[in-house]
């Protein structure tokens, strides 16, 4: 605890002090005071440098004195024999005696008192920048007029901060300009303009004189401009060393003027004004700016329009132009938007065709669609070549954006039929010879595939079963083989309106209009074992003449068994209708005269016992197309006959082409349209 005064006595004082003693006293007076230590008695064994016995006075790390011997006062009016004055508030006194004393020494008596120190004069470093005022136990600093004392309570400065300039034009100068600026000051000026305007500062060289930099190039007094994260300066010296026009690119500017204690000059003066924030004329590829200007400033709006084949993509929406506004920060709005080449995207796939994966799907790219040849061809022309157009669509020169349509090639068997041996009297065949051949298992019969969705057959095949199960693509009708082939599911059966439905079909004698269409639920996939037969044309070229040859196929009765396991076929000629009339009906269910013969029927066969028979009904009588020898068309459908192995009657398909086309059109799916 600090005290204002105190007494210090050597051990046993006033008796002789003992040998081999070391004792210390720590003196402390309150802050702001010094210590006056004085001895009134001193009797300590004398030795050189007081090496044996001594009293030592230490202030901090400094030895203020070391005493030994005997002393007496020089002043009869004062008892003081030795004294010390220190400007610090702490002092240490140490007394030491060695192992022997040749005489009896009484030691010392000393006293200390707290004394005032003059901080204004007693120290090398002056505590105040301007005026220092001492008082007992302390001091205070004060300032000349118009200066104020800083928070450190030591330094004076001018009150030159806090000014905020908001006008679009103005002038700012250092304090007292052009008289010398105050020392030891920090002046801060703020310019705050409306957003969208940048502060532009202009100075004249002669309006600037600030204490020059030291030898290391550091400004002793300095002027600094701060705009956001950009700094201009520090500047100092005679004549402004920076640019005379400073575009800050900011609506906010802080001006900081810092001075030290020495070397005042006249200072500086500047003007400022607000410029609308410029936005750079950016190079946006593949686009045009409207309006076109040399310079764009705050609030200017431009429309950026993409060149043909380019678009601006925002999210998932593509547009051909966008607006951009010069913003208050000097940046364009929508600056992330760019005119990119139009992307037509992955081209749509087409049924029964393909498109090679394009190297690029951007504007100008070219793709080619092809159909799965040789089973499909491109119906709607256009060559299959599409390019990525400016509107983002794949476009064909002929079809425009419409996709090509791959439709089945009709009437072309993968392998031609060859009669290998002498269906009745026919030969073994392969389904590849008759890829249009459809097998009906209840009743056991045939049909002809005419396109992806339609099967042509005889009316008497489906009159008793409107939900027939059909199979394609198999030469054998063993259950095991059919299980691995394609089963067709009917959606609807259309029997010709001219076909007379009977209560007892077994007694039928009238097979006129023996034709029906089966609409399939799903499209049939074409290939080497499944592909349609063509329909006859309507021209006279498709009128059959006696002797014209046609092919029949099926799994009906043969000479050897009631049902063929493997497909049989025969080539037989067209015969006059009377030849069929002349054959006696094998198992007549009515009078021979009751059987009806009409122009809707074709008579064929009679050669080498080749004929269709029970179980072949509905199959095609295929004739070579007169206008394209590579193709076959369904000239007839196996209908009925007087006796197997003689002549057979076939429905004349040419007479029903209009009905077939109309029925298919009226019952087509949108996919087929």
């Amino acid at each position: 605890e600090p005290t204002m005064y105190g007494e210090i006595l050597s051990p046993n004082y006033p008796q002789a002090y003992p040998s081999e003693v070391e004792k210390s006293w720590d003196i402390e007076v309150p802050e702001g005071y010094g210590i006056h230590l004085y001895f009134t008695h001193l009797d300590i064994e004398l030795s050189e440098n007081c090496a044996y016995d001594s009293v030592q006075i230490i202030s901090g790390d400094t030895e203020e004195g070391r005493l030994c011997g005997q002393r007496s006062s020089n002043n009869p009016h004062s008892p003081i024999v030795e004294e010390f004055q220190v400007p610090y508030n702490k002092l240490q006194v140490i007394f030491k005696s060695d192992f022997s004393n040749e005489e009896r020494f009484t030691g010392f008596a000393a006293y200390y008192v707290a004394t005032d120190i003059n901080e204004c004069t007693d120290f090398v470093d002056v505590p105040c920048s301007h005026f220092c005022n001492n008082f007992i136990g302390g001091y205070f600093c004060s300032c000349p007029p118009e200066y104020f004392l800083h928070d450190d309570m030591k330094n004076c400065g001018v009150n030159c901060s806090g000014d905020v300039f908001t006008a679009l034009i103005g002038e700012i100068a250092s304090p007292n300009y052009p008289k010398p600026y105050p020392e030891n000051s920090r002046c801060e000026y703020q310019i705050r303009l409306e957003k969208g305007f940048q502060v532009v500062v202009t100075l004249r060289r002669e309006d600037f004189d600030v204490e020059a930099a030291d030898s290391a190039g550091n400004c002793l007094d300095s002027l600094v401009f701060v705009a956001g994260d950009r700094q201009f300066g520090p500047y100092c010296g005679h004549g402004f060393p920076g640019p005379l026009n400073i575009e800050t690119k900011s609506n906010a500017l802080d001006i900081i003027f810092q001075t030290d204690l020495t070397g005042q000059k006249k200072g500086w003066k500047l003007r400022y004004h607000g410029d609308p924030m410029p936005c750079p004329k950016e190079d946006t590829p593949n686009s045009v700016w409207e309006p076109a200007k040399a310079k764009y400033v705050f609030r200017d709006v431009v429309q950026i329009t993409c060149l043909d084949g380019f678009e601006v993509v925002e999210g998932r929406v593509g547009a051909t132009s966008f607006y951009s506004t010069c913003q208050s920060n000097g940046k364009w709005s929508n600056s992330k938007l760019k005119c990119q080449p139009v992307d037509c995207g992955i081209p749509e796939s087409i049924e029964n065709g393909k498109v090679e994966d394009p190297e690029s799907t951007l504007f100008g790219s070219v793709i080619r669609y092809t159909c799965e040849e040789p089973y499909y061809y491109m119906e709607n022309g256009g060559g299959g070549e599409y390019h990525c157009a400016g509107n983002g669509s794949w476009v064909n020169e002929v079809l425009g954006p419409e996709l090509p349509k791959c439709v089945p090639v009709c009437g072309v068997p993968r392998e031609p039929f060859e009669e290998k041996q002498r269906i009745i009297g026919g030969s073994d065949a392969d389904i590849k010879n008759f890829p249009w051949q459809v097998f009906f298992d209840n009743p056991w019969a045939g049909g002809a595939l005419i396109n992806e969705y339609w099967v042509l057959t005889a009316a008497h095949v489906v009159e008793g079963n409107r939900e027939p199960t059909m199979y394609v693509g198999s030469t054998s009708v063993q259950t095991s083989r059919l299980a691995k082939s394609k089963m067709l599911t009917p959606e609807h059966v259309f029997i010709h309106p001219g076909w007379k439905l009977l209560e007892v079909p077994e007694g039928r004698t009238n097979f006129d209009n023996d034709i029906a269409l089966v609409r399939l639920k799903d499209p049939v996939k074409m290939g080497p074992t499944v592909s349609p037969i063509c329909l006859p044309g309507t021209s006279s070229d498709y009128n059959l003449m006696d002797g014209d040859l046609g092919l029949i196929s099926g799994w009906g009765r043969t000479e050897k068994r009631d049902r063929a396991v493997r497909l049989k076929a025969a080539r037989l000629p067209v015969a006059p209708l009377r030849k069929c009339k002349e054959v006696k009906v094998e198992k007549p269910t009515a009078d021979a005269e009751a059987y009806v013969f009409t122009p809707n029927m074709i008579c064929a066969g009679g050669e080498k016992g080749m004929d269709s028979c029970k179980g072949d009904s509905g199959g095609a009588f295929a004739v070579q197309d007169p206008n394209d020898k590579t193709k076959f068309y369904a000239a007839g459908l196996v209908s009925w006959g007087p006796q197997c192995g003689t002549y057979g009657l076939y429905t004349r398909v040419k007479n029903y082409v209009d009905w077939i086309m109309k029925t298919m059109q009226e019952n087509s799916t949108p996919r087929e349209d």
């Epitope: 209840n442 199960t469 199979y471 063993q478 095991s480 396991v565």
Partner: antibody
Framework: QVQLVESGGGVVRPGGSLRLSCAAS????????MSWVRQAPGKGLEWVSG????????GYADSVKGRFTISRDNAKNSLYLQMNSLRAEDTALYYC??????????????????WGKGTTVTVSS | DIQMTQSPSSLSASVGDRVTITCRAS??????LGWYQQKPGKAPKRLIY???NLQSGVPSRFSGSGSGTEFTLTISSLQPEDFATYYC?????????FGGGTKVEIK
């Protein structure tokens, strides 16, 4: 030529088991159904069991139901008859025969157009 | 189960005779019926399928007829090699059933 050869017959005690095999050759085995038919000494023919071309459908005579199991291995062109809990009345000559199945959803069977020579099973204590 | 009743169980005939064997089904079987010939110590052989269809390789003196419940096997002119036992088989439904057999012997 088309051929069926049965094997696996023999003498077995009542309650015992036997497994008959039928090896097929000369035709595409997995296109046909197959049957087992037996004939007790001096008696007529009795159909025992049948299986379709892919083994998914089987049938049994009431007299063997629950005791006999028909199966086939198309990869090995083989037909089998596993006979368990054998009785004296199962003593017979066992034939395997080929069945033709035509048609799809609605099919037509032509049974037993080709027969093997048979294998004898004797159940006796 | 469908029962097949075959008659007669045996018959004696001479070479050249016309022989008729009948098979009656306990219920209608349409035409799902076959006829088999078995000679002693031999496996059966199919003669007729689907009631009236002649098996390939079988002489044409054999014929089958009938539908529903009544079926007939006819040998138009009996030959020495025809002396055997004849069975009918119904395959309308499982279990398949054979007739009891008809033994044709030499008179």
């Amino acid at each position: 030529q088309v051929q069926l050869v049965e094997s696996g017959g023999g003498v077995v005690r009542p309650g015992g088991s036997l497994r008959l095999s039928c090896a097929a050759s000369g035709f595409t085995f997995d296109d046909y159904g197959m049957s087992w038919v037996r004939q007790a000494p001096g008696k007529g023919l009795e159909w025992v069991s049948g299986i379709n071309w892919e083994g998914g459908s089987t049938g049994y005579a009431d007299s063997v139901k629950g005791r006999f199991t028909i199966s086939r291995d198309n990869a090995k062109n083989s037909l089998y008859l596993q006979m368990n809990s054998l009785r004296a009345e199962d003593t017979a000559l066992y034939y395997c025969a080929r069945d033709e199945q035509l048609g799809g959803k609605y099919y037509y069977y032509y049974y037993m157009d080709v027969w093997g020579k048979g294998t004898t099973v004797t159940v006796s204590s | 189960d469908i029962q097949m009743t075959q008659s007669p169980s045996s018959l004696s005939a001479s070479v050249g005779d016309r022989v008729t064997i009948t098979c009656r089904a306990s219920q209608g079987i349409r035409n799902d019926l076959g006829w088999y010939q078995q000679k002693p110590g031999k496996a059966p052989k199919r003669l007729i399928y689907t009631a009236s269809n002649l098996q390939s390789g079988v002489p044409s003196r054999f014929s089958g007829s009938g539908s529903g419940t009544e079926f007939t096997l006819t040998i138009s002119s009996l030959q020495p090699e025809d002396f055997a036992t004849y069975y009918c088989l119904q395959y309308r439904s499982h279990p398949l059933t054979f007739g009891g057999g008809t033994k044709v012997e030499i008179k």
